[in-house]
């Protein structure tokens, strides 16, 4: 018989579990890249776009070498939950100009949700605590203008792209240590 219901099951092969998370992350990364390219084609925008409500990028110089699995998974899950909320908000708040990308944004949101579920499962299999975000989610107000929502979309997709790259790099690096 398996473990009692509700208790975390320690995976027999954490490398396989990590593999499956990496696969989903890479898939989402490709989707995000494609959507970001579509955004740039339809709504060219010069320079970096920032949104104060987005999480700061997890990886900075020198930090990847010292990563530990619990920290990576917790940070990744918290950051991706934030991006999930931002994509949701973008779909609701987007003006007519962004409505043309609604199917792609919907698919992206569904993939993000799937990855979040996979990370949650991985954390429970590894008996890691299901960390809550450090601070409660700040309500996202409507964009100031149609141009504001376009700039927000650029910022969200750009940040998500970099976060997912950090995730793939971090997870594969950790896999080599298992």
């Amino acid at each position: 018989p398996g473990p009692p219901a509700g208790s975390p099951r320690v995976s027999s092969d954490p490398r396989a579990d990590l593999d499956s998370a990496v696969l989903l992350t890479r898939s989402l990364l490709a989707d995000t890249r494609q959507l970001a390219a579509q955004m740039r084609d339809k709504f060219p925008a010069d320079g970096d776009h920032n949104l104060d409500s987005l999480p700061t990028l997890a990886m900075s110089a020198g930090t990847l070498g010292s990563l530990q699995l619990p920290g990576v998974l917790t940070r990744l899950r918290v950051d991706l939950m934030s991006y999930f909320r931002h994509v949701q908000w973008l779909r609701r708040a987007a003006g007519p100009s962004l409505k043309t990308l609604e199917p792609e944004l919907g698919a992206l949101q569904a993939r993000l949700e799937r990855l979040l579920r996979r990370l949650q499962l991985l954390m429970s299999r590894l008996a890691l605590p299901q960390a809550a975000p450090d601070q409660p989610a700040v309500p996202l107000g409507p964009p100031a203008s149609a141009w504001g929502s376009i700039r927000a979309a650029h910022a969200i997709l750009g940040g998500l792209h970099l976060t997912l790259d950090w995730a793939v790099r971090g997870l594969l690096l950790l896999k080599t240590r298992l």
Epitope: R26, M59, S60, A61, L64, L162, R169, L172
Partner: antibody, heavy 119, light 111 residues
Amino acid sequence: EVQLVQSGAEVKKPGASVKISCKASGYTFTDYNMDWVKQAPGQRLEWIGDINPHNGGPIYNQKFTGRATLTVDKSASTAYMELSSLRSEDTAVYYCARGELGHWYFDVWGQGTTVTVSS
Amino acid sequence: DIVLTQSPASLALSPGERATLSCRASKSVSTSGYSYIHWYQQKPGQPPRLLIYLASNLDSGVPARFSGSGSGTDFTLNIHPLEEEDFATYYCQHSRDLPPTFGQGTKLEIK
């Protein structure tokens, strides 16, 4: 035109260090990782590591950890690789290459920098 | 680390013929529809040039006479019909795990 232009050939003594530069142009520098690959005579190509220019986060092949240091100057769209404690086996052509985020395939390469380590 | 073994080590063919180059991985480099194998061409004194990424996708600007196939541990690069400029060394590379590694190369020579 998308281009990576590397610094010139170097001749170094064993124990010394070498720093190679790689200047990117024709694309948004922070949209791709910058990877470094070694090609020694008669040996297979070897991945040294890569760096995310957006935030300067490097990762290394364990074989080069501690001796290779990857850095970027985002404002100059330039990546650098420093290799320390040089030995004769480090004699090779070193390439920088543009890496697709999260996938490690390299679609644009620098022309290569020959490093010769000899006493 | 995953080891990639290419065969044959060298191959002599004439323009117009078909070249079939093989790359075998020491463990599977495929997962759920993705195969993390890439192919490069290198000529003397030049850097490698990406031909095929993720097993079967042609990089931009690469002629359609190049094609890639395979999954799991066995992969193939086909060139047909061979042209004069195709005589070079070809490398496969994986990116399934870290570190990415390369095969030892197949040298395609003119007969």
